[in-house]
Each structure stands twice: as C-alpha cells, then as structure tokens.
Amino acid sequence: QQQTLPKPFIWAEPHFMVPKEKQVTICCQGNYGAVEYQLHFEGSLFAVDRPKPPERINKVQFYIPDMNSRMAGQYSCIYRVGELWSEPSNLLDLVVTEMYDTPTLSVHPGPEVISGEKVTFYCRLDTATSMFLLLKEGRSSHVQRGYGKVQAEFPLGPVTTAHRGTYRCFGSYNNHAWSFPSEPVKLLVTGDIENTSLAPEDPTFPADTWGTYLLTTETGLQKDHALWDHTAQNLLR
C-alpha cells in the first residue's frame, strides 16, 4: 500500500535569481485533488495554501513580494490528498541578487576569437567575496563556479562556435546572496561555415531583457521543471 504521494515539482517565476526588493513567485505543482500545499523554508514551515476547488487545481503559487537576503535560501513543498502526504519536492535554491557591488568581467585574448583558440574569462570584484559565478545567457544553463580572493579565472579551453554568446558574472557573498551582474561580454567565435551550421548558437536575448530573463526563459522553465531542478540548481549544492 502506498504510504506517500509522488513528490511535487517546485520552481520560481520569473526566476530563482531574484534582484533584491523585487517580487518572486514560488510555484508548487502536485496533483488534482490536493487539499493542502505546504511550503517549507530552510526546514521550517513557511506558508500554507488550500486550493479551491481542489479537484480543478494542481498547482499553487506562493508570493514573496519583496526579496531580500533573509528570504533567500532553500525551499521545498509538499501536498496532501485526504490524509495522505506527498514526498517533499526537490530543493529550490532562491538567490537574491543585486547585493552590494558590481563585478567586472573581461575575456582573454579578447571577445573575438577563432574556433580552437583557448579563451579565459576573468571576473573581478574588490569586496569581500571569494566565490564567483560565470553565466552564459541562453535556454541552457551554462554556469561555472570559480574561486579567488578578488578575481576568479574561468578557462573555457579551446572554444567552438557553441561557445558564442553573451556572458555575465556575479560575485557570491554566500550560496544565496549574489552581487549585481557584471556588464555583458559578447563572445564571438568564428569558424568555417560548415562547422557553424553544425553548432547552432543557444537562443540569446537582448541585453536589456537580462533582468527578467537571466538563465532561462519562463516558458523553458515551465516545460521541464524536473530538468531545471537538476541542472541550473546544481551549482548551488
């Protein structure tokens, strides 16, 4: 006899990286007929929702109107059908960004390189942080973590046209509190036409959409919550 229900999916909209003082919604998707959802924060009960009518709703949304460092951390959710509770969802790491300072991102040998060249990004921040994160815009979650007193190196190795795109970096004050994003650096990788056609670029977005777009599009996020849980969030573990 089944003792628990399948775990729900948890995700954040528009994104798990939330600029301070901005709003975020934590979504929990369980099953139709669930009479209660519970959101837990760092192991403690944070919020409760009872959808009405439960038989027509399989997802609830928990609103955080004003993101700050005290709200950043690990969230999970569970739901109940009758007296039977679900397994807990995967952990959602909610990150507050735009804290304190802005790092500087540079690339060596430069932003325009030939396929096969070795490329290294450098992220520098002169305040008290030793962890840095390099992110490539696009639906895929290209995230690298680096360490250094005031600067981290991110060697990409010999690049291909798949490395083309717009990069930004963050300084991380702890796992859930990140700096402002750096100014974007667009990496252009030239190769022969045949190779280029075989390595399409990730869908990228204009720089001014960064604030709402960040690592992934909302639609991409909604299409596969499980995949999202296991990719972009893994850097925080």
Epitope: A47, K52, Q61, Y63, R70
Partner: nanobody
Amino acid sequence: QVQLVESGGGLIQAGGSLRLSCVASERSLTLYAMGWFRQAPGLEREFVAGISRTGDTTYSPDSVKGRFTISRDNAKNVLYLQMNSLKPDDTAVYYCAASATYSATNIYTHQRAYGDWGQGTQVTVSS
C-alpha cells in the same frame, strides 16, 4: 507599510477566554495575509494562527488548534484572535503581522514572510 495596533490582552485565569484585536490604520487590510505570533520570555517568536487575504482560509499549529480561532473583518480593517481554554503555557506577548500578497489563498506561517508588525499585547494566564 501598514500600522498595526493590538489590544485585548490582560490577566486571565486558566480555562478562561480572551479576544485579541488588531486594527490597521491608513491602508486596507484586504491587501494583506495576516497572522498572529507570540513570544514568551526567553523563547523565540512562535506562529499561532494565520489567515488569507479574503478570510476564506485559516491555519493554526497543533498546539492551539481547536482553542484559538483567527478571523478578520476587512470592512472594519480588523484582525481577531479568539482564545479559549487558555493555559498558563499561553502566557506571552501576542503580535499581529501583515504580509502583502497577490494571492487570495496564501497563509504565511514564518515570521520572515511578514513585513509589518504591531507592538504586541501582553497575555498572562494564571493557574
């Protein structure tokens, strides 16, 4: 922000009842999910009861379930906590709190979810 003022506390014998009120000034309470917390000397602040914006949904922990009832009158901008069968363990300062939310059904149980707090009202239950 919303200003919150609690009242209704006092000294009561074990087994008695009290009704706490929390009046909001300036802004409409309909914008907020509301909650009651309490803090006894030397202990952490503890969630006691929460209610959704519309008042349709409430939640209380097992420690007070069946004894404490939270309700709200959005027309009057008032939040209530009806406390029955009081015990000496219920002695504490009781605080009401408000959390701005778009959701009609969210109830917040964690103090970090609440942005606005009252000054508190003392409830003392004697044996």
